[in-house]
């Protein structure tokens, strides 16, 4: 803690502040700081069977302070907290404990999942994906010409990773057989790519069955509509990333 | 879209009660606290404290204390704010607005909020 | 309670010009890594809107004519280039320590 002390001082009168070190205005032999300079706030610190009164510029971790209009003072957040805003709200909870709203839980709400890295209760976020993009030509071998039948695939993008309550992704990737009216290569399109043609409309009497790629079959369950928004994921992003540095408090 | 509807102007008479309401739409209600505002000409904004609409745990500025009491509805998503003994002091706008998405209260600013309840006192 | 002092207390920007509006808080409102200081600009008749969050992140839909940059005791709005819709009272607001408060409002207007 960024902490300006004021010492205990070797003087017989209880109320006077001349002498006293640190940000004490009021000081005694016995008790320390009795009161504090502007915006110190008034803590009490035990040492060995007796408690002497410091002056801090903050709140030590599991107090929160309260401006008061004769004093500012440091009290004791709840036993399950390690840092709060007040009496009521903690903003970092005990280890063992999650936060959710301000309160620290051994266990997270229904519908929600805990996260073991910010100990915090988060929503479930589910997998989302993108609409499929256009079958690819039909090929063969990687050839587009020169055969009957071939395979067409077509690909869609995880728009959303799922945390780990979340729902699984469905297949990202099919693959179906489709028939060509066989036609010769011509010279320069020997070996040309499928990928390298767009191909605008599905060719007549093509095989409908899709063949889900192996690669990508996670799971098929269905994606909720109720997901988190694109600024709430955005905003607890940036709220990450800050409590990445160090976890929040507020003091 | 989000939004918070607040009920409507209220003209009462010194030492009664006012209870004022907020419905949230468009979000999960319980995800998010709400706060209360407090806009006068003297004052400017104040804020007078929060509610979290999960737990119903709230929390106020010393200076509203005893003055205001939060309460919320989950079953209709809306918030309460009961305002006791007015007296002309307490003439002012009041807002309703939601709290950013956190379980920190450091991270509940004001992302949304309601078009106002004007509150008059007046014998 | 943590005391936000803006200034000025109004401002006359010529169109296409840049407006500045600052904030001191009578504390730090960094906490941590975190620094808890917000700005909201509101129009007459209308509610406060968000423009700022966590000193310098552009909330969603706002244009990014508006910055926000300052930390510890500091902070400044910038609204680059100005338009005619920018008329309005412009607010810093912190929810490090309880109370949360707000600052006395700049009020902006476009000549």
């Known amino acids: 803690q960024n902490a300006s002390r004021g010492r205990r001082q070797r003087r017989m009168h209880p109320n006077v502040s001349q002498g006293c070190q640190g940000g004490c205005a009021t000081c005694s032999d016995y008790n320390g700081c009795l009161s504090c300079k502007p915006r110190l706030f008034f803590a009490l610190e035990r040492i060995g069977m007796k408690q002497i009164g410091v002056c801090l510029s903050s709140c030590p971790s599991g107090y929160y302070g309260t401006r008061y209009p004769d004093i500012n003072k440091c009290t004791k957040c709840k036993a399950d907290c390690d840092t709060c805003f007040n009496k009521n709200f903690c903003t970092k909870c005990k280890s063992g404990f999650y936060l959710h709203l301000g309160k620290c839980l051994d266990n997270c709400p229904e519908g929600l999942e805990a996260n073991n890295h910010t100990m915090e209760c988060v929503s479930i976020v589910h997998c989302e994906v993108s609409e499929w993009n256009p079958w690819s030509p039909c090929t063969k071998k990687g050839k587009t010409c020169g055969f009957k039948r071939g395979t067409e695939t077509r690909v869609r993008e995880i728009i959303q990773h799922p945390s780990a309550k979340g729902n699984l992704c469905p297949p990202t990737n099919e693959t179906r057989k489709c028939t060509v009216q066989r036609k010769k290569c011509q010279k320069g399109e020997r070996g040309k790519k499928g990928r390298e043609r767009k191909r605008k409309k599905p060719n007549k009497g093509e095989s409908k069955e899709a063949i889900p790629d192996s690669k990508s079959l996670e799971s098929s369950k269905e994606i909720p509509e109720q997901r988190e928004n694109k600024q709430q994921q955005k905003k607890r992003k940036v709220q990450d990333k800050q409590k990445s540095v160090s976890v929040s408090t507020v003091h | 879209q989000v939004q918070l509807q607040q009920s409507g102007a209220e003209l009462v008479r010194p030492g009664v009660s006012v209870k004022i309401s907020c419905k949230g739409s468009?979000?999960?209600?319980?995800?998010?606290?709400i706060h209360w505002v407090k806009q006068s000409h003297a004052k400017s904004l104040e804020w007078i404290g929060v509610?979290?609409?999960?737990?119903?745990?709230?929390s106020y500025n010393q200076k509203f204390k005893g003055k205001a009491t939060m309460t919320v509805d989950k079953s209709s998503s809306t918030a309460y704010m009961e305002l006791a003994r007015l007296t002309s002091e307490d003439s002012a706008i009041y807002y309703c607005?939601?709290?950013?998405?956190?379980?920190?209260?450091?991270?509940?600013?004001?992302?949304?909020w309601g078009a106002g309840t004007s509150v008059t006192v007046s014998s | 309670d943590i005391v936000l002092t803006q200034s000025p207390a109004s401002l006359t920007v010529s169109l296409g010009q840049r407006a500045t509006i600052s904030c001191r808080a009578s504390?730090?409102?960094?906490?941590?890594?975190?620094?808890?200081m917000h700005w909201y600009q509101q129009k007459p008749g209308q509610p406060p809107k968000l423009l700022i969050y966590?000193?310098?992140n552009l909330e969603s839909g706002v244009p990014a004519r508006f910055s926000g940059s300052g930390s510890r005791t500091d902070f400044t709005l910038t609204i680059d280039p100005v338009e005619a819709d920018d008329a309005a009272t412009y607010y810093c607001?912190?929810?490090?320590?309880?109370?949360?408060?707000f600052g006395g409002g700049t009020k902006l207007e476009i000549k």
């Open positions: 468009g979000y999960t209600f319980t995800d998010y606290v």
């Open positions: 607005a939601r709290g950013a998405y956190g379980n920190s209260p450091s991270y509940w600013y004001f992302d949304v």
């Open positions: 509610i979290t609409t999960y737990y119903g745990d709230a």
């Open positions: 504390e730090s409102v960094d906490s941590y890594g975190n620094t808890f």
């Open positions: 966590l000193a310098s």
């Open positions: 607001q912190q929810n490090n320590e309880d109370p949360y408060t």
